[in-house]
């Protein structure tokens, strides 16, 4: 198939990093600077992505592959191929149209990106709150009352051993 295709279309012989120049009897010409072709047989090259402003270059453009960008410190990538950079916030905050705002009571964010999420509702699982939540951390749910029945394993620490000769009050 490849041999048939190349007989039919001379451009299929042009490798990545070149374009098939129709003005020059379909010879393979190298891509101009700041452009690339990642596949063979292309009739034009593609303009290299330029990582400017809040974007910084993670990988330089070559004649066969596009540049790759990431974000400058204080920003993080969003979208396929880091198409956008979004401002970081502190843990315990979320980004709004007016900038970084603290999470409302009852919500938390343990990352520098994303939105504040509600604390876990321990009672939905029949559990109790072992550690209270903060703006930066979710609550930690403790054992359910059923877990505390005799013979059941418990996450609560064991009671300290009584001294000999002391009877329970």
């Amino acid at each position: 198939f490849e041999r048939t295709r190349s007989l039919q279309d001379p451009c299929s012989n042009c490798p990545a990093g070149t374009f098939c120049d129709n003005n020059r009897n379909q010879i393979c010409s190298p891509c101009p600077p700041n452009s690339f072709s990642s596949a063979g047989g292309q009739r034009t090259c593609d303009i290299c992505r330029q990582c400017k402003g809040v974007f910084r270059t993670r990988k330089e453009c070559s004649s066969t592959s596009n540049a790759e960008c990431d974000c400058t410190p204080g920003f993080h990538c969003l979208g396929a191929g880091c198409s956008m950079c979004e401002q970081d916030c502190k843990q315990g905050q979320e980004l709004t149209k007016k900038g970084c705002k603290d999470c409302c009571f009852g919500t938390f964010n343990d990352q520098k990106r994303g939105i504040c999420r509600p604390w876990t509702n321990c009672s939905l699982d029949g559990k109790s709150v072992l550690v209270n939540g903060t703006k930066e951390r979710d609550v930690v749910c403790g054992p359910s009352p059923a877990d505390l029945s005799p013979g059941a394993s418990s996450v609560t620490p064991p009671a300290p051993a009584r001294e000999p000769g002391h009877s329970p009050q």
Partner: nanobody, 122 residues
Framework: EVQLLESGGGLVQPGGSLRLSCAAS????????VGWVRQAPGKGLEWVSA????????YYAESVKGRFTISRDNAKNTLYLQMSSLRAEDTAVYYC???????????????RGQGTQVTVSS
Amino acid sequence: EVQLLESGGGLVQPGGSLRLSCAASGFTVSAEDVGWVRQAPGKGLEWVSAILDRGGSTYYAESVKGRFTISRDNAKNTLYLQMSSLRAEDTAVYYCARVVYHAGGGVTYDYRGQGTQVTVSS
């Protein structure tokens, strides 16, 4: 119609210098991305140098960095390539080229001149 006329080539000894000129008509060199490509005997075309982003940046192939300098004279609508410390491997036909940006986002280039032969030999 776009026309590019190269001159300044010749026979030079290794370590010598040459200055190539490209007189352009049909477009303005200061408003375009322009440069030089070369074709060595039995080899494919190679980009040597270019002035890009309307003069905002320059490109040099690794093999010529520090030895070649690209420039232009807007008043004369002429592009230049100053070549120094020439080596045998610089022997090639040198063409002036204009980068062409297509509506669909593709990039190609024109090099319509006859080129100028540079031969580096002792």
